[in-house]
């Protein structure tokens, strides 16, 4: 048994369309068949769930239809994309990985990715 390490980038800049992508990688200490990945947002000392998905190893990771997240998985790496971000959503986004099955359960928590979101300037009216 070893503690599970989760790695994620320190900083990501969202695109002008409010889309941010980052990789969440975990060092699996066991042979998990069922993995749950959760994106948490930490503001001050408050932690809220942004989105979560459970997937079977070797299968694709599926978020709920109304989720603002999409993602793909490859081995012990998950590529996460968060959409619809605005400047007020700038903050620390933590990747949480849980090895759900088979036992034992493992919890791994990343240090967080600071996502910066800049709202695009509205286009000025052009007189042509």
């Amino acid at each position: 048994c070893k503690a599970m390490h989760v790695a994620q980038p320190a900083v990501v800049l969202a695109s002008s369309r409010g889309i941010a992508s980052f990789v969440c990688e975990y060092a699996s200490p066991g042979k998990a068949t069922e993995v749950r990945v959760t994106v948490l947002r930490q503001a001050d000392s408050q932690v809220t769930e942004v989105c979560a998905a459970t997937y079977m190893m070797g299968n694709e990771l599926t978020f709920l239809d109304d989720s603002i997240c999409t993602g793909t998985s490859s081995g012990n790496q998950v590529n996460l994309t968060i959409q619809g971000l605005r400047a007020m959503d700038t903050g620390l986004y933590i990747c949480k990985v849980e090895l759900m099955y088979p036992p034992p359960y493992y919890l791994g928590i990343g240090n967080g990715t600071q996502i910066y979101v800049i709202d695009p300037e509205p286009c000025p009216d052009s007189d042509f």
């Epitope: 069922e34 749950r36 932690v47 493992y106 919890l107 928590i109």
Partner: antibody, heavy 118, light 108 residues
């Protein structure tokens, strides 16, 4: 505000069964792992079991494996612990506790006392 | 399973003194997954520290946590009368989730 209220404790004879309940309110129940932790009189804390999110995954302490079943009803915001083949060493205060999103146990119920005695 | 050992078993101190409580794990624990709880007689445990060093909401800053790997410490900088209680460390990174046996801080 978050509230956890346990019920179902009491005096029960060895070999019999008991079902404990924990009514939760003030948070999104299905987003949290929910645990039972027990404490024998004058002793320390012992983790008993957890049920995760939709209830499909559960884990147990060796001391209760095969005798305990943890379950949850997300539509009723209620956590359960069914204990069978009770032994004297199961005598304890049973606490229901919430796993915070980062994993630690942030809210605890007041506890319900189970006494196994003939 | 990860076994947590706490020392000392009992700490006898006076109000205003500094308390240093130790928690040692039988194998490496992620510092993200180590918590400290306080329990007073007849009450449920109360979360003090999570992630080895983060104070829970409403916990006074005289409580601090530190450590990594297998060695963790809870420090109470100046004991107040209400701090005399039993303190438990816990790891929540690998099931079964385990608690230390506790350290009782009592009045000298």
């Amino acid at each position: 505000q978050v509230q956890l209220v346990e019920s179902g404790g009491g005096v029960v004879q060895p070999g019999r069964s008991l079902r404990l309940s924990c009514a939760a309110s003030g948070f999104t129940f299905s987003s949290h792992g929910m645990h039972w932790v027990r404490q024998a009189p004058g002793k320390g804390l012992e983790w008993v079991a957890v049920t995760w999110y939709d209830g499909s995954n559960k884990h147990y302490a060796d001391s209760v494996k095969g005798r305990a079943t943890i379950s949850r009803d997300n539509s009723k915001n209620t956590l359960y612990l069914q204990m069978n083949s009770l032994r004297a060493e199961d005598t304890a205060v049973y606490y229901c506790t919430r796993g915070e999103l980062l994993g630690y146990f942030d809210y605890w119920g007041q506890g319900t006392l189970v006494t196994v005695s003939s | 399973e990860i076994v947590l050992t706490q020392s000392p078993g009992t700490l006898s101190l006076s109000p205003g003194e500094r308390a240093t409580l130790s928690c040692r794990a039988s194998q490496s624990v992620s510092s993200s997954c180590l918590a400290w709880y306080q329990q007073k007689p007849g009450q449920a445990p109360r979360l003090l520290i999570y992630g080895a060093s983060s104070r829970a909401t409403g916990i006074p800053d005289r409580f601090s946590g530190s450590g990594s790997g297998t060695d963790f410490t809870l420090t109470i900088s100046r004991l107040e009368p209400e701090d005399f209680a039993v303190y438990y460390c816990q790891q929540y990174g690998i099931s079964p989730f385990t608690f230390g046996p506790g350290t009782k801080v009592d009045i000298k």
